[in-house]
Interface confidence: low
C-alpha cells in the first residue's frame, strides 16, 4: 500500500500577498520529482489575514506580529512538521506599500522590517519580504494563469480546463485589478515595442516570449474611487457630494483628511472650506461612467496607441484572463458568464446602480455594507477601464474570461512569484530528469 503522504515526495511553498486592502497567505504543494513540469504545482490553502493591508499598520507596527499569527499558525497545521524547515516563505507587497514608500521610504522600510522579524519567528525557511514592482506583479500574474492553463507545455496535460480550454498554445493575456493598482500583460502580435519600459522578454520551457506589461498605480478600484471623490468634491455643491456611483438613498460622511491621505489624490487636492463631506447616492450608471472617464487622460499619447495617461498600449491580442477584483466584483454582480455580452453587462449595471440602497441592503443582507455600497462604482469602473482604458470593444469583450480559480488555484501573481523564486520554471524544455535552470523574469 502506498504511504498516504510521504513528506520527502511532496514539497510546499508559502507566499503572502500583502495587498493594499488585505493580506492573503497561499500554500502551494507539488510532487518533488516533477517540480520542473508545467502545471504540477497547485494551491492547497488560502488564508485571509484579518484586518487591512500592512501599509495601514504604519502607526502601529507593534501589532503586525499578532496580525499575521492566525494565518501563519494555519500554515503550521497544513504543512507536515517534517517539511517546515524546507518550506520557503515569501512575502510580496504590492501597490499599497508602493504608495506608502512614495510618501516615506523610512516608514515603508519600518513596516517591512517588522514584517520580516515577525515571519522569521516561524519554523519555515523565510526568504524575505519585499515590495514587488508593478512590472513584476503583471509578469507573475501572466505566468500564473498560463502555467495553470498549461500554455507553456508541449505535452498533453493530465487535466482539462473548462471553460478556458483552447487547443492552441497561444498564451492568455492577464488583467489584474487590485485595490491600489491594475495590471495588463499580454503577448502582442508585433514583437517590436515602442516603449522599452513596457517590454519583458523571457524564455520559458524552451520558448521565447516578448511580453507587454504595464501597472497603473492609483488605478486599483479603491484608489480609483478616492481619485473620483477628490475630483468630484472640487466642483460639488460644497460638503454634499451627489454621487451617481452610489445607490439612491445611500449616505456616508467622508473626512477630507482621509481623502487626501493617499498620494493618488494629490493631483486633485485643494483647500476645502470643510473638514467633512457627505456622499449622497443618486444611483445613475451613465453619469457614474462619465465621472469615471474623467480619471483617464486620453488627450495625450506620444505613441501610435495608448491606454490612458500617455502610456503605450499595443493592439490587444488573443484571450485574456481577468482576475482578482475583476473577478470578485463581476462574480458578485453575476456577470462572469461567457454568454453575457458587453451590452448586457452595461444594461445590468444600469439596473443595479439605480436600485435604492435600502432595497440593496435587504437583498444582500449578508454582505458588509462597506463593500456592498461600492459594487456600483466598482462594476462601472471595471467597464470603463476595460472599454475606454484598455480599448476592448463589444466584439472583443468575448475574449475576456473572468477567472477566480484555475484547477483550484487562485489566479494572481503569487504562484508565478513562487515558481520564479524557487526556479521551478526552466528556461528550456525539461528532459525526463529535471534540470535546474533559472528563469529570466
Amino acid at each position: 500500500t502506498q504511504n498516504k503522504a510521504l513528506p520527502e515526495n511532496i514539497k510546499y511553498g508559502i507566499v503572502l500577498d500583502a495587498g493594499s486592502s488585505h493580506t492573503s497567505l497561499y500554500i502551494y504543494k507539488w510532487p518533488a520529482e516533477k517540480e520542473n513540469d508545467t502545471g504540477v504545482v497547485h494551491q492547497v490553502e488560502e488564508c485571509r489575514v484579518k484586518g487591512p493591508g500592512i501599509s495601514k499598520y504604519v502607526q502601529k507596527v507593534n501589532e503586525i506580529g499578532i496580525y499575521l499569527t492566525d494565518c501563519m499558525e494555519r500554515a503550521r497545521e497544513v504543512i507536515p512538521r517534517s517539511q517546515h524547515q524546507e518550506t520557503p516563505v515569501y512575502l510580496g507587497a504590492t501597490a499599497g506599500m508602493r504608495l506608502l514608500r512614495m510618501e516615506s521610504e523610512e516608514l515603508a522600510d519600518r513596516v517591512l522590517d517588522v514584517v520580516e522579524r515577525s515571519l522569521s519567528n516561524y519554523p519555515f525557511d523565510f526568504q524575505g519580504a519585499r515590495i514587488i514592482t508593478g512590472q513584476e506583479e503583471g509578469a507573475y500574474g501572466w505566468i500564473t494563469i498560463n502555467y495553470l492553463l498549461g500554455k507553456f507545455s508541449q505535452k498533453t496535460r493530465w487535466f482539462s480546463i473548462v471553460p478556458y480550454e483552447t487547443n492552441n498554445q497561444e498564451t492568455f493575456g492577464a488583467l489584474d485589478l487590485g485595490g491600489a493598482s491594475t495590471q495588463i500583460t499580454f503577448v502582442p502580435q508585433n514583437q517590436t515595442t515602442e516603449s522599452p519600459d513596457n517590454a519583458l522578454q523571457f524564455r520559458l520551457y524552451g520558448k521565447d516570449y516578448n511580453v507587454y506589461t504595464h501597472s497603473f498605480l492609483c488605478y486599483g478600484k479603491d484608489q480609483a474611487l478616492w481619485q473620483k471623490l477628490a475630483k468630484d468634491i472640487q466642483v460639488a455643491s460644497n460638503e454634499i457630494l451627489r454621487d451617481p456611483c452610489f445607490h439612491p438613498g445611500y449616505k456616508k460622511v467622508v473626512n477630507v483628511s482621509d481623502l487626501y491621505k493617499t498620494p493618488c489624490t494629490k493631483r486633485f487636492e485643494m483647500t476645502l472650506p470643510f473638514q467633512q463631506f457627505e456622499i449622497q447616492g443618486i444611483g445613475n450608471y451613465q453619469q457614474c461612467h462619465q465621472s469615471v472617464l474623467e480619471l483617464f487622460n486620453t488627450s495625450y499619447c506620444p505613441y501610435s496607441q495608448c491606454a490612458f495617461n500617455g502610456i503605450f498600449l499595443p493592439p490587444l491580442q488573443g484571450d485574456f484572463g481577468a482576475f482578482s477584483a475583476f473577478y470578485f466584483v463581476m462574480n458578485f454582480l453575476n456577470l462572469t458568464s461567457e454568454k453575457v455580452s458587453q451590452e448586457k453587462v452595461t444594461e445590468m449595471m444600469k439596473k443595479f446602480c439605480s436600485q435604492p440602497w435600502e432595497e440593496i441592503k435587504t437583498s444582500y443582507a449578508g454582505v458588509k455594507e462597506k463593500y456592498l455600497s461600492e459594487y456600483c462604482f466598482s462594476g462601472t469602473y471595471i467597464l470603463s477601464l476595460l472599454l475606454q482604458g484598455y480599448h476592448f470593444t463589444a466584439d472583443s469583450w468575448e475574449h475576456i474570461h473572468f477567472i477566480g480559480k484555475i484547477q483550484g488555484s487562485d489566479a494572481g501573481w503569487t504562484l508565478g512569484y513562487m515558481l520564479n523564486l524557487t526556479n521551478m520554471i526552466p528556461a528550456e524544455q525539461p528532459l525526463s530528469t529535471p534540470l535546474s535552470h533559472s528563469t529570466y523574469v
Epitope: A236, S237, I240, Q276, N284
Partner: antibody, heavy 119, light 109 residues
Framework: EVQLVQSGAEVKKPGATVKISCKVS????????MHWVQQAPGKGLEWMGR????????KYAEKFKNRVTITADTSTNTVYMELSSLRSEDTAVYYC????????????WGQGVMVTVSS | DIVMTQSPDLAVSLGERATINCRTQ??????????MNWYQQKPGQPPKLLIY???SLASGVPDRFSGSGSGTDFTLTISSLQAEDVAVYYC????????FGGGTKVEIK
C-alpha cells in the same frame, strides 16, 4: 405641511447686531439645508449663507463672511441668522429658505423679516 | 462664486410668449444634472419656485411655464402670458452654493 415662520420686523442703529429666527414646523430641519437670502428695497435676491443642521456645518457668501453667523437649534427646529456691524445698506428683507437635501427643489420660504438700519 | 446674468426687463402682450434668458459664468451641470432653478416674485411676497433642475416643473405651477438649457445658457418661457404672471423672475444656480441672477421684470404691454 411644512411652514417657515420668521420673527418680527426690527429697527437697528448702525453698528448694532440683529438676530432673526426662522422656526420650521411640519418637518425636521435636519432634512434640509437652511439658507438665508437678503433683498434690499427695489433690489434683487442675494444669497447670504446656509447651515446644514444635521452636521452644524455653515457656509457663507464672501460679501457677508465676516459679519454673518448662522446657527441651528434642532431641539426647537429653529434656525437663526445674526448680522453684526449693521450699516444703512443692510436695510432689507431677510428670508430663510429650505433646500431639500440633496438640493433638487427649494421647497419652502419664510415670509421675510424687514430690518431697518437707521440712526 | 458663479456669476449670473439675466436678460433685461420685458413687456409682453397678454396671451403672447415671454422668454427670459439667463447666462452663467461657468457650467452649472454636474454629471448630467443641471442645477438651475427659476423663481417668480411678486411685490411683498417671498420668491416662489417655478422650475428646478433646469426643466422640472415645481408642484402646483401651471404648465405654461417651462425651462430649458444646459451648461451655461438657460431660458424660462411663459407660453401664453396671463395677467397674474406680472412679476420679477430670477434664475438661480444651486450647483455651487447659491447665486441669483439680477432679476427680469415682466410687464404687460
Amino acid at each position: 405641511e411644512v411652514q417657515l415662520v420668521q420673527s418680527g420686523a426690527e429697527v437697528k442703529k448702525p453698528g448694532a447686531t440683529v438676530k432673526i429666527s426662522c422656526k420650521v414646523s411640519g418637518d425636521s430641519i435636519t432634512a434640509y439645508f437652511m439658507h438665508w437670502v437678503q433683498q434690499a428695497p427695489g433690489k434683487g435676491l442675494e444669497w447670504m449663507g446656509r447651515i446644514d443642521p444635521d452636521h452644524e456645518r455653515t457656509k457663507y457668501a464672501e460679501k457677508f463672511k465676516n459679519r454673518v453667523t448662522i446657527t441651528a437649534d434642532t431641539s426647537t427646529n429653529t434656525v437663526y441668522m445674526e448680522l453684526s456691524s449693521l450699516r444703512s445698506e443692510d436695510t432689507a428683507v431677510y428670508y430663510c429658505a429650505t433646500e431639500r437635501v440633496p438640493g433638487f427643489e427649494t421647497d419652502y420660504w419664510g415670509q421675510g423679516v424687514m430690518v431697518t438700519v437707521s440712526s | 462664486d458663479i456669476v449670473m446674468t439675466q436678460s433685461p426687463d420685458l413687456a409682453v402682450s397678454l396671451g403672447e410668449r415671454a422668454t427670459i434668458n439667463c447666462r452663467t459664468q461657468q457650467t452649472v451641470d454636474h454629471y448630467g444634472t443641471t442645477y438651475m432653478n427659476w423663481y417668480q416674485q411678486k411685490p411683498g411676497q417671498p420668491p416662489k419656485l417655478l422650475i428646478y433642475l433646469a426643466s422640472s416643473l415645481a408642484s402646483g405651477v401651471p404648465d405654461r411655464f417651462s425651462g430649458s438649457g444646459s451648461g451655461t445658457d438657460f431660458t424660462l418661457t411663459i407660453s401664453s402670458l396671463q395677467a397674474e404672471d406680472v412679476a420679477v423672475y430670477y434664475c438661480q444656480q444651486s450647483r455651487n452654493l447659491w447665486t441669483f441672477g439680477g432679476g427680469t421684470k415682466v410687464e404687460i404691454k
